[in-house]
């Protein structure tokens, strides 16, 4: 799925308006990414509990297990993002898969992801049938990681 | 930084050409995202070795430590992506931070990230000063996670 761009539209003050209203399917087809998180969403109960499974997706087998929460904005590309939510404060023991080990912390790994917002073009609200894509950095938690607690010097 | 889009350019067969060649700085300013990985790149030696540090960024404190490898494509948005490369096959012990524990595997977490490629518009190579942004899913490894080995049923 591709979007045709006028060369220079990123900086020239003028671009020609289009002749018709864009059907919603077109924008959403272009803006919607894979609507799945890095790991398939697990609908089994253990994906929401503080334990490390011996099967299933990575987020439920991790000793720092997490669930995924949807973040949806139809005016953003990609429209769906997923945030990792840690299910335990500490890491789960590799031996038992259930008891927490206070020697390890389960912490989210954050990332500033590049996203684009559909916006009215600056200074021409309502005057033209065109829009701008605004590049932004958007903070998402990608996963939860088992780390050794930080020792302050 | 925003890019002006003609409404309808995502699906209409024609869009007006611009009157001038876009300066390279404009595309790069728009396409370049934050050129940093989720965690600051560590230039100390331990970030490249199989051990869990007690300080430094998350990827070096993790018991499934990883390093970041740059993937740069000037015709892609974002132009810089980072791939996580696991530094250990097994998880590092929480007690020692150095010895590996065979009960846990250190595995990459993969994600199909939305990216955009600058392409000549279909069927009009060289005829107009415009280009298309093609949305693609691109596989990146986000981090390395300590998991319990999968038990096959």
């Amino acid at each position: 799925v591709s979007l045709r761009i006028q060369e220079g539209c990123s900086h020239l003050p003028s671009c020609c308006p289009s002749k018709e209203q864009e059907p919603p399917e077109e924008w959403l087809k272009w803006s919607s990414a894979s609507v799945s998180p890095p790991e398939p969403l697990s609908h089994t109960h253990h994906a929401e509990s503080c334990r490390a499974s011996k099967d299933g997706p990575l987020n439920s087998r991790a000793i720092s297990p997490w669930s995924y929460e949807l973040d949806r904005d139809l005016n953003r590309v990609p429209q769906d993002l997923y945030h990792a939510r840690c299910l335990c404060p500490h890491c789960v023991s590799l031996q038992t898969g259930s008891h927490m080990d206070p020697l390890g912390n389960s912490v989210p790994l954050y990332h500033n992801q590049t996203v684009f917002y559909r916006r009215p073009c600056h200074g021409e609200e309502g005057t033209h049938r065109r829009y701008c894509l605004e590049r932004r950095l958007y903070r998402v938690s990608l996963a939860c990681v088992c780390v050794r607690p930080r020792v302050m010097a | 930084v925003s890019l002006r889009i003609q409404e309808g350019c995502s699906h209409l067969p024609s869009c007006c050409p611009s009157k001038e060649q876009e300066p390279p700085e404009e595309w790069l300013k728009w396409s370049s995202a934050s050129v940093s990985p989720p965690e600051p790149l560590s230039h100390t030696h331990h970030a490249e070795s199989c051990r869990a540090s007690k300080d430094g960024p998350l990827n070096s404190r993790a018991i499934s430590p990883w390093s970041y490898e740059l993937d740069r494509d000037l015709n892609r948005v974002p132009q810089d992506l980072y791939h996580a490369r696991c530094l250990c096959p097994h998880c590092v012990s929480l007690q020692t931070g150095s010895h590996m524990d065979p009960l846990g595997n250190s595995v990459p977490l993969y994600h199909n990230q939305t990216v955009f490629y600058r392409r000549p518009c279909h069927g009009e190579e060289g005829t107009h000063r415009r280009y298309c942004l093609e949305r693609r899913l691109y596989r990146v490894s986000l981090a390395c996670v300590c998991v319990r080995p999968r038990v096959m049923a």
């Epitope: 399917e25 959403l28 609507v35 973040d71 139809l74 916006r119 | -």
Partner: antibody
Framework: QVTLRESGPALLKPTQTLTLTCTFS??????????LGWIRQPPGKALEWLAH???????HYKPALKSRLTISKDTSKNQVVLTITNVDPVDTATYYC?????????????????WGQGTLVTVSS | EIVLTQSPATLSASPGERVTISCSAS?????MYWYQQKPGQAPRPLIY???NLASGVPARFSGSGSGTDYTLTISSMEPEDFATYYC???????????FGQGTKLEIK
């Protein structure tokens, strides 16, 4: 012309399950970007959003009520159903269904552009 | 969860008067939406995306604001404008719609 109509029981007893149906016409819930939500308003109080369902069957719920709410759609019947389990007198309210999905040149609006007339539900022992 | 606080809760005004209703968000948001509700009726959209008038809404209504502070203004009150007004926002994570507690506009 877009219309929405809510239907459901006027009176329930505490602990019962409330099932509300929104029947709509003039648009399709299978159209990309379209969504339908439920909002309630206790007598003399403010509007409170409860749940939302999108064209692609993605569902959202008010976090504080999530465990009690279920929203579903039947696109062929042009209906959306909301169930609320274990009702209490504080659930007494006028329940509205409303549409969201207006695309402008600048993008989608997250306002509810069409509303039903509402149905009053009383929970009392 | 973002909280919307409207002020004042009640406002008395006379026909012809200029009226301003405020809506404050507990954290920064991109856009605000406004509705009018009359007794026994469903809410009616007034303002889309902070400042765009909904279809059929008279030009005496306007919206403005950014960040955490948003305003609905009625430049010259008409008798039919006496009603309750609500601000509303959409938050993408977690996806939720939130309404303000309402401002009741009464005849002085």
């Amino acid at each position: 012309q877009v219309t929405l109509r809510e239907s459901g029981p006027a009176l329930l007893k505490p602990t019962q399950t409330l099932t509300l149906t929104c029947t709509f016409s003039g648009f399709s819930l299978s159209t990309s970007g379209m969504g339908l939500g439920w909002i309630r308003q206790p007598p003399g109080k403010a509007l409170e959003w409860l749940a939302h369902i999108w064209w692609d069957d993605v569902k959202h719920y008010k976090p504080a009520l999530k465990s009690r709410l279920t929203i579903s759609k039947d696109t062929s019947k042009n209906q959306v159903v909301l169930t609320i389990t274990n009702v209490d007198p504080v659930d007494t309210a006028t329940y509205y269904c409303a549409r969201m999905g207006q695309l402008h040149y600048y993008g989608y609006d997250y306002a509810m552009d069409y509303w039903g007339q509402g149905t009053l539900v009383t929970v009392s022992s | 969860e973002i909280v919307l606080t409207q002020s004042p809760a009640t406002l008395s005004a006379s026909p012809g008067e200029r009226v301003t209703i405020s809506c404050s968000a507990s954290s920064s948001v991109s856009y605000m939406y406004w509705y009018q509700q009359k007794p026994g009726q469903a809410p009616r959209p007034l303002i889309y995306r902070t400042s765009n008038l909904a279809s059929g809404v008279p030009a005496r209504f306007s919206g403005s604001g950014s960040g955490t502070d948003y305003t609905l203004t009625i430049s010259s009150m008409e008798p039919e404008d006496f009603a309750t007004y609500y601000c509303q926002l959409y938050h993408s994570y977690p996806p939720t719609w939130t309404f303000g507690q309402g401002t009741k506009l009464e005849i002085k």
